[in-house]
Interface confidence: medium
């Protein structure tokens, strides 16, 4: 062994462990024949106090006893909780150049006596588990503190276990390693916890319990479900349980749900029938167990069983809409569209749709199946046609949904009045209207249909629509509505055999267009100028264009330009103006206006009319 303290010793009175607020005396003594050579009287012993490796105090002034050149005693007070290091050094005062030499050191631990442990609680997990107890230790002692857990019961049963707390680990739980069996169900057991450290000891109050108080059954295992006759709504949930279980709690929910269905089952013996399941739905099932109807604790929830219920035939009605386009004098193209059933109606994976087009009088029938949500056919323009669509999964088909094919905008008397479209926010548009004024027949329903006004949208994109009851005069449209895009919105009024419609354009948010129209040509005809232009590219329109403005002024003039404003029509791309002087060179340009404002000007064109003055 190497002796770090070969020069002397350091001792502490009353002990190296003291209660908070107490003082201690530290004595530093030199061994015989150690010290400053030849001059024992020049030996000076000093005591240094370190906290976390930092020298915080030279205790020279705390010296309470001194045997010159041999030993010194220092009193230390106001020590903080935890550990403090004291090092004694020898200073040979006749040799100023040599630093003090370490003699020895000591650590003093400051702490508190343990408080009585409280809130003892014991559990035994499962009939074959072991008893484990936990408690609240109270205030931190800052010292190594031993805890003893003692259990006593009938037939002189005694058992104890120990653990300790220090600044590295906490002891507030112990497993006694013994098993209480159900035949002791009525017996009473007592546990207490004793805490002891260098500054004192304390005991908890005795805690009394019975077998039923502390035994928590193991969670059920091997959970499975059997669907009766492959039913999607009825199934028998089965599981394994410990033998003594008398009560179970079942909980189940669709995976995307936030609330559980709860069921209590008494004496279920590992089996329970469920009758209210949704077909073709991912469910999560869990079970908990209890050993006694009134007392005892519930087990933890079992591991989840996740499974999908079987399919059942679809229910509900498909939402169908259509478009008619005349091809020539005796043929028309019918495009049928329908919306997918929601999962609770589809009740399985929709494999295909059965589509039927029937001419009522001649009994001509066209039938097909498709996996898509649209179907197009060319049929004669004559006759009264009706369409029906049904959805099929592996278990069957939904009832067909019928719709009469009428001329959707054929009857002016059925056209809704005062149609307006107002932007509500970035994602939707409020459409309102008044009923037709002089309808021959009663309106059965309104259809609000909308489509982005962009090139090819009629052929590329299916329409979006909403069915509105006949007593409603408004609709909030939001499906596929994006800001800064103009939509053509049609409100159809449908009777049994006729249709009328009104059209309006609308947007959910708008800005001034990015650019103005591009003037492509200026031509002179019969003393009038015709201005031709190309429309602003779709992405640059940034909403519904309300009108175009044509500006002109004499070249080199500083006067305000003249202008005419044209109501926007998608089909129009030229306009006449007739107030220009002949043989005067003019500069012309155009802008576009949305509800948010006017675009920058488009290209400028110069033109000098040749005709007579108007």
């Amino acid at each position: 062994n190497i002796d770090v303290c070969k020069l002397g010793t350091v001792t502490v009175q009353p002990a190296p462990v003291i209660p908070l607020g107490s003082a201690a005396n530290i004595s530093c003594s030199l061994n015989p024949k150690q010290g400053c050579s030849h001059y024992p009287s020049s030996n000076e012993l000093i005591l240094l106090k370190f906290v976390n490796d930092v020298l915080v105090e030279n205790l020279h002034g705390k010296k309470v006893h001194d045997h010159t050149g041999h030993s010194s005693t220092f009193q230390v007070t106001n020590l903080s909780l935890g550990m403090t290091l004291f090092v004694c050094k020898l200073n040979c005062s006749n040799s100023q150049k040599k630093p003090p030499v370490p003699v020895c050191g000591v650590e003093i631990s400051v702490g508190v006596a343990p408080e009585p442990p409280q809130n003892i609680s014991c559990v035994q997990e499962g009939e074959n588990g072991t008893v484990a107890c936990s408690w609240n230790s109270g205030k931190v002692t800052y010292l190594k503190t031993n805890y003893t857990l003692q259990l006593s019961g009938p037939n002189n049963l005694t058992c104890q276990k120990q653990c300790f707390s220090d600044n590295r680990q906490n002891c507030n739980r112990l497993d006694l390693g013994i098993n209480l069996s159900p035949d002791l169900a009525e017996s009473r057991f007592i546990v207490r916890v004793t805490a002891i450290n260098d500054l004192g000891n304390s005991s908890s109050l005795p805690h009394t319990f019975t077998f039923l108080d502390i035994v928590i059954p193991l969670p059920p295992w091997d959970i499975r479900i059997n669907f009766l006759n492959a039913s999607g709504s009825r199934g028998t949930l089965q599981w394994e349980d410990e033998g003594q279980v008398v009560l179970n709690q079942l909980r189940y929910q669709p995976l995307n749900s936030t609330s559980w269905n709860m069921v209590n089952a008494t004496n279920a013996k590992g089996k329970y029938d469920l009758r209210d399941l949704r077909p073709f739905t991912e469910y999560e099932f869990q079970i908990s167990s209890k050993l006694h109807l009134s007392g005892g604790s519930w087990s933890n929830w079992s591991e989840s069983l996740r499974t999908r219920t079987p399919e059942e035939e679809p229910v509900g009605i498909l939402d169908i809409w259509y478009m008619k386009q005349d091809i020539d004098y005796d043929r028309q193209q019918i495009s049928l569209f329908w919306k997918s059933l929601n999962p609770s109606e589809a009740r399985g994976k929709i494999l295909h749709y059965q589509v039927t087009l029937q001419e009522v009088t001649k009994k001509t029938t066209l039938q097909n199946t498709t996996r898509h949500t649209s179907w197009t056919r060319v049929i004669p323009r004559t006759g009264a046609w009706t369409a029906s669509v049904s959805a099929a999964n592996s278990k069957g088909a939904s009832a067909p949904t019928h719709i009469n094919i009428v001329d959707l905008c054929g009857t002016g008397l059925l056209a809704p009045h005062q149609v307006s479209a107002k932007s509500e926010n970035m994602d939707n548009i409020l459409v309102t209207w008044q009923p037709p004024k002089k309808a021959d027949s009663a309106v059965r329903e309104y259809i609000v249909e909308w489509r982005a006004l962009q090139p090819g949208s009629i052929t590329k994109f299916p329409p979006h629509w909403l069915r509105i009851p006949p007593d409603n005069m408004s609709a909030l449209i939001s499906e596929n509505i994006k800001p800064y895009i103009c939509y053509e919105i049609r409100v159809h009024a449908l009777s049994e055999s006729q249709g009328g419609c009104s059209s309006i354009r609308g947007d959910s948010k708008h800005k001034a267009p990015v650019s103005g129209p591009h003037i492509t040509a200026i031509t002179e005809k019969k003393e009038r100028l015709f201005i031709s232009w190309t429309h602003i590219p779709f992405p640059e329109q940034r909403g519904c264009i309300l009108h175009y403005r044509i500006y002109w002024k004499e070249r080199d003039s500083t006067a305000q330009p003249e202008l005419c404003e044209i109501q926007y029509r998608r089909s129009q791309n030229s306009h006449p103006i007739s107030s220009l002087q002949p043989r005067v060179t003019y500069v012309l340009w155009m802008t576009a206006v949305t509800a948010a404002g006017e675009s920058p000007q488009g290209n400028e064109r110069e033109f000098c009319p040749q005709g007579k003055a108007n």
């Epitope: 062994n1 770090v4 906290v51």
Partner: nanobody, 118 residues
């Protein structure tokens, strides 16, 4: 079986740095002090630095104070000695030791050679 295993020694130029490691295994060290000692050829083994495993308090020989730093990693059960501004007189075999009090060491490692030379 209790074991202290030093590593990290080697040849270094004056003014250079080295980091020694001492891996402690075979028991709980919570109530122990861990120290570094060194022994130069023909000299007695001398104390270098000390750390209390539980509190992390440290203590150094005056000859290394400000140049050497002792630390410990409780998770890895390892004590380190970071040696900076090394001098030729720091040349020695460095030993790791463990003991229950300030001046008593029960377990020793095999040592690792540190040579400071240009």
């Amino acid at each position: 079986q209790v074991q202290l295993q030093e590593s990290g020694g080697g040849l270094v130029q004056p003014g250079g740095s080295l980091r020694l490691s001492c891996a402690a295994s075979g028991r709980a060290w919570n109530e122990y002090n861990m120290g570094w000692f060194r022994q130069a050829p023909g000299k007695e083994r001398e104390f270098v630095a000390l750390i209390w495993w539980s509190s992390g308090n440290t203590y150094y020989a005056d000859s290394v104070k400000g140049r050497f730093t002792i630390s410990r990693d409780k998770v890895k059960n390892t004590v380190y000695l970071q040696m900076n501004s090394l001098k030729p007189e720091d040349t020695a075999v460095y030993y790791c030791a463990a003991g229950p009090t300030f001046n008593k060491y029960e377990y020793w490692g095999q040592g690792t050679q540190v040579t400071v030379s240009s």
